[in-house]
Amino acid sequence: TQHGIRLPLRSGLGGAPLGLRLPRETDEEPEEPGRRGSFVEMVDNLRGKSGQGYYVEMTVGSPPQTLNILVDTGSSNFAVGAAPHPFLHRYYQRQLSSTYRDLRKGVYVPYTQGKWEGELGTDLVSIPHGPNVTVRANIAAITESDKFFINGSNWEGILGLAYAEIARPDDSLEPFFDSLVKQTHVPNLFSLQLCGAGFPLNQSEVLASVGGSMIIGGIDHSLYTGSLWYTPIRREWYYEVIIVRVEINGQDLKMDCKEYNYDKSIVDSGTTNLRLPKKVFEAAVKSIKAASSTEKFPDGFWLGEQLVCWQAGTTPWNIFPVISLYLMGEVTNQSFRITILPQQYLRPVEDVATSQDDCYKFAISQSSTGTVMGAVIMEGFYVVFDRARKRIGFAVSACHVHDEFRTAAVEGPFVTLDMEDCGYNIPQTDESTLMTGRA
């Protein structure tokens, strides 16, 4: 939900067609009753389209009105279209809901590239392919927007899953997940498996496909392989974490680790790209260019503006390096690394001119607001947002796209000293200068 290529996110298919799935490994962590195991009813409850966001079906009001809602860990408002809009097939009609309550308050939310405003109220909300509960939640009824809704995306609202600190108009507006936990017995955690397709999807393919899973209140073993590794949530506003080291094909970028987290590093399902602070982006691109120098790409490609295409099935994945981010671990002086493949950071797009080619955009971009671990990162991993224990877990996703030579990885432990020094302390400024997630 940060800036850059935000909100509009990309998704894809789950299941076998996604490419090779890794075999399950035994889970070394002890069971935590009520939080781990099988959540069959929630598996495969996300859909989406490359670059346009992963969404879950929700119902709002009485009688229930069904809407598709973008899952966004980079913002904290639950907001739905509530007026006709050219890009919406349907919208929330408050006047038809007997349980709607007007909060008599307006709200305005600017993202980097989109904005909306609306009126606050509360209503009964449930997630059909989620926990079997109904909660009264705050809802922003969007009455006016600019570059927010996306033509053909098939979602009509946004579910901000981050913390109250970044809710608009202020932190007194309780976010949906807080209401859910407070009003039910759902444990205070959720997990996301976002499944990139590895190839572009047309409208009908998206509607027929699975884009992943949002497991509310728990962890599903079938969605990941190997072990879960946890990094502390540094501060409960965005899902802020600390990156302590970055490697391209095993080569350390050798920057002051504060640069990696300037001015923050967040995990954001509502952003398409891996977004990096200017200095880090420049160093990373330089290193990726060097590693892939057997082929030359135009500058526009590295800026995320131009496609590169190869004849179908001939994409030279092997010339592109893997990227490893080392995250602060739960134990003092201990870190772990998550490694993504070019299959994650080269985003498949449809080439208008020739459908015989496989075309891609470079999905790493520059940020002025810190590191954003968007879909490019998340599509490689099963990500556990363990709010109860103030930590985020990463494991290799059972649906990540890879080839026969390399897979995404989560590995540790590594010894890393003085990791606390890697965090950047944002000077206290007026809260009103905060940009809410998305772009």
């Epitope: 007026a83 008599r104 308050k105 307006g106 405003e117 009126e119 009455t143 006016e144 108009p169 009103s432």
Partner: antibody, heavy 124, light 107 residues
Framework: EVQLLESGGGLVQPGGSLRLSCAAS????????MGWVRQAPGKGLEWVSA????????YYADSVKGRFTISRDNSKNTLYLQMNSLRAEDTAVYYC?????????????????WGQGTLVTVSS | EIVLTQSPATLSLSPGERATLSCRAS??????LAWYQQKPGQAPRLLIY???NRATGIPARFSGSGSGTDFTLTISSLEPEDFAVYYC?????????FGGGTKVEIK
Amino acid sequence: EVQLLESGGGLVQPGGSLRLSCAASGFTFSSRAMGWVRQAPGKGLEWVSATSGSGGSIYYADSVKGRFTISRDNSKNTLYLQMNSLRAEDTAVYYCAKGGSQWLYAPGSWFDPWGQGTLVTVSS
Amino acid sequence: EIVLTQSPATLSLSPGERATLSCRASQSVSSYLAWYQQKPGQAPRLLIYDASNRATGIPARFSGSGSGTDFTLTISSLEPEDFAVYYCVQRSNFPWTFGGGTKVEIK
């Protein structure tokens, strides 16, 4: 220079209707929220209604809800206030005001300048 | 409804003096509060928005402060043209409401 010129005021009987207009110039009308504020003779100010730039967001004071309708014609750079079922307490000078942005609820998006007003008198 | 109470109702001061006008909200309006000035026979004009930001073209002698429920408009040194009625207004909650006004008159 921004200009806002209200018209359509006058004397009307209780229960009657009037339509106020506000002709705007000197700025991109469609990219600004617009509003109506009224002031009864010798009294303070009261917000009546406001609309966002495209007309998606609309605000009404409780005292006029269901009786007054705000609308805008962005092709004519004109804001309207249709007032039905008028009451004696609606007697006031009605000011048209320009918003600070297209948004109705954005911080910083306050209303300024205002027109010189048009007097509406509801009396039998 | 949020009630804005302005005090004093009238402030009698001489040019060059400092004027301090108060606006108290019946519940928090965060920083969604503005101040307008109105002279006889004229439309109001915006002085301060979002509690403390000076509107375009407003002299530096006007300043606003406060958040939540207590707000102050200060005119550091009154000029002859500053004698007028001052209104605070909130847009935090519906209905948007004005205070009753403070009249600053020449002593």
